[in-house]
């Protein structure tokens, strides 16, 4: 099966790489604009230059193109704890990230929030914190993992999943209660 091509892709595929078909005259192939520029005017004829202009401040194009407007630079989301890693240039969008000892949690494909890496108090680091993943902790005896924190088994309710992990401790507590002094 032939994959379905969009109109723009169909038009571009008629011309060699780095060129696009003139929108008003499909016998003319115009040279695409370099990254950092956008299309101001199509080339007037074969072998003639495309009129490309540099993107204005606050906008960019990251690859060769025949866009009529540059793309707006992204802004890092302070409300998500994001910080600017590198600022926007005419040929590259803003790069946003997190501070040291934080990781990115993606709520959706294009939205992430920065959270502090877990320190594994009352446990040990099983896997170190990474750019897109929190530390993986292993808890010491007498503690269980809840939302990536090691919590004392004394906070384990019978109905919760922790009962399996805390079973020896729970039995010990029962044992102490049951053993009367004779």
């Amino acid at each position: 099966l032939v994959p379905h091509l969009g109109d723009r892709e169909k038009r571009d595929s008629v011309c060699p790489q780095g060129k696009y078909i003139h929108p008003q005259n499909n016998s003319i192939c115009c040279t695409k604009c370099h990254k950092g520029t956008y299309l101001y005017n199509d080339c007037p004829g074969p072998g003639q230059d495309t009129d490309c202009r540099e993107c204005e401040s606050g906008s960019f194009t990251a690859s060769e193109n025949h866009l009529r407007h540059c793309l707006s630079c992204s802004k890092c989301r302070k409300e998500m704890g994001q910080v600017e890693i590198s600022s926007c240039t005419v040929d590259r969008d803003t790069v946003c990230g997190c501070r040291k000892n934080q990781y990115r949690h993606y709520w959706s494909e294009n939205l992430f929030q920065c959270f502090n890496c877990s320190l594994c108090l009352n446990g040990t680091v099983h896997l170190s914190c990474q750019e897109k993943q929190n530390t993986v902790c292993t808890c010491h005896a007498g503690f269980f993992l809840r939302e990536n924190e090691c919590v004392s088994c004394s906070n384990c309710k019978k109905s919760l999943e922790c009962t399996k992990l805390c079973l020896p401790q729970i039995e010990n507590v029962k044992g102490t209660e049951d053993s009367g002094t004779t």
Epitope: R77, E79, W107, Q113, F115, N116, N134, E147, N148
Partner: nanobody, 119 residues
């Protein structure tokens, strides 16, 4: 005690509009970023839109961009979601919540309000 109470859901025809409200109490509303999430039948939670504590910074999922508008009234401790040009795929239970601070889970959220888009 933190309480979040959503309202404004209902049955609406495709192309119609609804305005959801979320009344908040038990915390300092104006110091919290707020979010609307939704859960369609048999699907996971989807982050729909959020608004910063200042009311200026907003975000919309691609699926609702240009159709939904989030806003807040800090004097009334209320969060809103204006939903226009509704589609069948917007059918879901809508919840409001605080933007989490400590980790990627919601500390508090309401009982939700059901939005059904059907002809």
């Amino acid at each position: 005690e933190v309480q979040l109470l959503e309202s404004g859901g209902g049955l609406v025809q495709p192309g119609g509009s609804l305005r959801l409200s979320c009344a908040a109490s038990g915390f300092t509303f104006e110091h919290e970023g707020m979010v609307w999430v939704r859960q369609a039948p048999g699907k996971g939670l989807e982050w729909v839109s959020h608004i910063g504590e200042d009311g200026q910074s907003t975000y919309y999922a691609d699926s609702v961009k240009g159709r939904f508008t989030i806003s807040r009234d800090n004097s009334r401790n209320t969060l809103y979601l204006q939903m226009n040009s509704l589609r069948a795929e917007d059918t879901a239970v809508y919840y409001c919540a605080n933007i989490p601070k400590a980790g990627p889970s919601f500390d508090y959220w309401g009982q939700g309000t059901l939005v059904t888009v059907s002809s």
